[in-house]
Interface confidence: medium
């Protein structure tokens, strides 16, 4: 199709080489009561259609994006070609950065009613830059956390390090939806609820002597609990004998609760005590086999090929540690009689 | 007995400024409310003015027609004020101190019975 | 500021009978919308919030619908005590909903 009457917007992603970071583009086709850009065209060149980020109207719910190379081939779909490029709804998500992301990426809907409508579409110019070392030292990260039931905020990285007097108006928008009264670097929440995480956008407008683009940033917002106060708990084994029988293989679980910790560093490990010696085993990897907002519980086996008559001698013991301290539980294997 | 209770209201010449105050009893502004002014014009509908967090953030709330001329915070653990200057004729109404809770349905759950205020020379 | 179209302004129906009320937001509010009741002489009360919740205390007669800019309110089997003033309100939708804008309401008279 012809793409040249796309409507056009630049956006320029600046992204930062220490952190992992994702960057979305919306796919901004107007809503159809409020523009006519989708009919058959009764727009003259110099009438600008009133674009509004895609809210999910029915009729324009489903899209199509392409990416158009800078060779001149023909437009490429994104889905069959791009396998870092996530397309979600409306949402173009991306979740690698990389200057080889910039690019122009089209995007349109699906369902044209008719052959005669001009192509309703947006073409978007990207430009992908690493940011400089001179650029402000202490830029607001983009995974940021929200202590649930507390007071919060929720800063827009690319200008994070302006004062709010100096700041431009910003436009946010929460998993793709305008967030009309928010325009500050600076989201305040006033009380944080676990409705307040997800995907946030802040936009604002770069201008040079030629053209203006649209500066974006993606911010991941999590809401948490307060740090625990406590050291993990063992949930398994209870016990601390263990009826066995000899020559079996034996596995013994290990199972612990940990409390929610904003850095967390679980520890988990079986080791063995005989006599006066003590070594770590090396067992399969931890897993975690539950995760609340609030805690985590993670499971480490020991397994025994089989159980020998020295091992009814030892004491198998289990090992948990966080931040705050650490917990053991032992085990004495017991031979079974009959 | 959760009660709000506004006071202020009076009748004053165009150009002036007036505070109106609006008093907590049965419970305190110090948890997560949002306590807001709203008006009546004689008549006519309800028209919203202003709100506060009662919370640590502090954060206020405008109808864009408000800025600049009304004023709202929170001066006790009891009362919140409105400070309303250069008023005009168009300001007179009877102003409504109300009370939400921010996950309690975005809605006014408690009101007071309001204070009149007249605005004529 | 979001505009809150409310209709019909004035709406006479006999005891009994049914009332339709439509608000009609200028942008999406998601179920961020409230409904209100108000009689001569008193502070509104709250009926309706969240869209289509009944408030506590508040007679099942009354219902709410809607979702996004159309939301509408019903009153069945409408006794005499219904006749009010009826306004509905929407939420800031922000990070933080606060409940701001209300519709420039409807009389209801009860024949």
């Known amino acids: 199709f012809n793409i040249s009457g796309c409507s056009t917007k630049k956006l320029l992603w600046t992204y930062s080489t220490r952190s992992e970071e994702e960057f979305v583009l919306f796919c901004d086709l107007p809503e159809p009561q409020k523009s006519h850009f989708c009919h058959r065209n009764r727009l003259s060149p110099k009438q600008v259609p009133e674009h509004l980020p895609f809210m999910g109207s029915n009729d324009l719910s489903d899209v199509q994006w392409y990416q158009q190379p800078s060779n001149g081939d023909p437009l490429e779909d994104i889905r069959k070609s791009y396998p870092h490029i996530i397309q979600d709804k409306c949402t173009l998500h991306f979740l690698t950065p990389g200057v080889n992301n910039s690019g122009s990426y089209i995007c349109r809907p699906k369902m044209i009613k008719s052959p005669y409508d001009v192509a309703c579409c947006v073409k978007m110019i990207l430009e992908v830059k690493p940011q400089t070392n001179a650029s402000c030292e202490y830029s607001a990260s983009h995974k940021q956390d929200l202590l649930l039931g507390s007071t919060g905020s929720i800063s827009c990285p690319s200008l994070s390090c302006q004062s709010d007097a100096q700041s431009p108006a910003v436009t946010w928008y929460k998993n793709g939806k305008l967030l009309s009264v928010e325009r500050s670097n600076r989201i305040v929440v006033d009380e944080v609820y676990d409705y307040h995480q997800g995907t946030y956008v802040c936009d604002y407008t770069q201008s040079d002597t030629v053209s203006s683009w649209t500066v974006r940033a993606v911010v991941q917002v999590r809401t948490i609990v307060g740090d625990t106060k406590l050291k993990p708990d063992i949930l398994d084994p209870v016990e601390d004998t263990l009826e066995v029988e000899l020559g079996k293989p034996l596995t013994i679980s290990c199972k612990a609760r940990f409390g929610f910790e904003r850095v967390f560093n679980p520890v988990i490990k079986w080791y063995i005590k005989d006599s006066d010696l003590e070594w770590e085993v090396s067992v399969p990897e931890a897993k975690s086999i539950k995760s609340t907002l609030k805690d985590e519980i993670i499971e480490r086996n020991i397994i025994l090929e089989k159980v020998t008559q020295r091992d009814l001698r030892r004491k198998f013991v289990c090992f948990v540690q966080n931040s705050i301290g650490n917990t053991t539980q032992s085990v004495q294997l017991k031979e079974k009689r009959g | 007995q959760e009660q709000l209770e506004e006071s202020g209201g009076d009748l004053v010449k165009p150009g002036a400024s007036l505070t109106l105050t609006c008093t907590a009893s049965g419970f305190s502004f110090n948890g997560n409310y949002y306590i807001c002014w709203v008006r009546q014009a004689p008549g006519k509908g309800l028209e919203w003015i202003a709100c506060i967090y009662a919370g640590s953030s502090g954060s206020t709330y405008y109808a864009s027609w408000a800025k600049g001329r009304f004023t709202i915070s929170k001066t006790s653990s009891t009362t919140v004020t409105l400070q309303m200057t250069s008023l005009t004729a168009a300001d007179t109404a009877t102003y409504f101190c109300?009370?939400?809770?921010?996950?309690?349905?975005?809605?006014?759950?408690?009101w007071g019975p309001g204070t009149l205020v007249t605005v004529s020379s | 500021d979001v505009v809150m179209t409310q209709t019909p302004a004035s709406v006479s129906e006999p005891v009994g009978g049914t009332v339709t009320i439509k608000c009609q937001a200028s942008e999406d509010i998601e179920s961020y919308l409230a409904w209100y009741q108000q009689k001569p002489g008193q502070p509104p009360k709250l009926l309706i919030y969240?869209?289509?919740k009944l408030a506590s205390g508040v007679s099942s007669r009354f219902s709410g619908s809607g979702y996004g800019t159309e939301f509408t309110l019903t009153l069945s089997d409408l006794e005499c005590a219904d006749a009010a003033t009826y306004y509905c309100?929407?939420?800031?939708?922000?990070?933080?909903?606060?409940?701001?804008?209300f519709g420039g309401g409807t009389e209801v008279v009860v024949k």
């Open positions: 309100q929407c939420t800031l939708y922000g990070v933080n909903f606060v409940p701001n804008v």
């Open positions: 969240q869209a289509s």
């Open positions: 109300v009370r939400d809770k921010p996950a309690g349905g975005s809605s006014y759950t408690l």
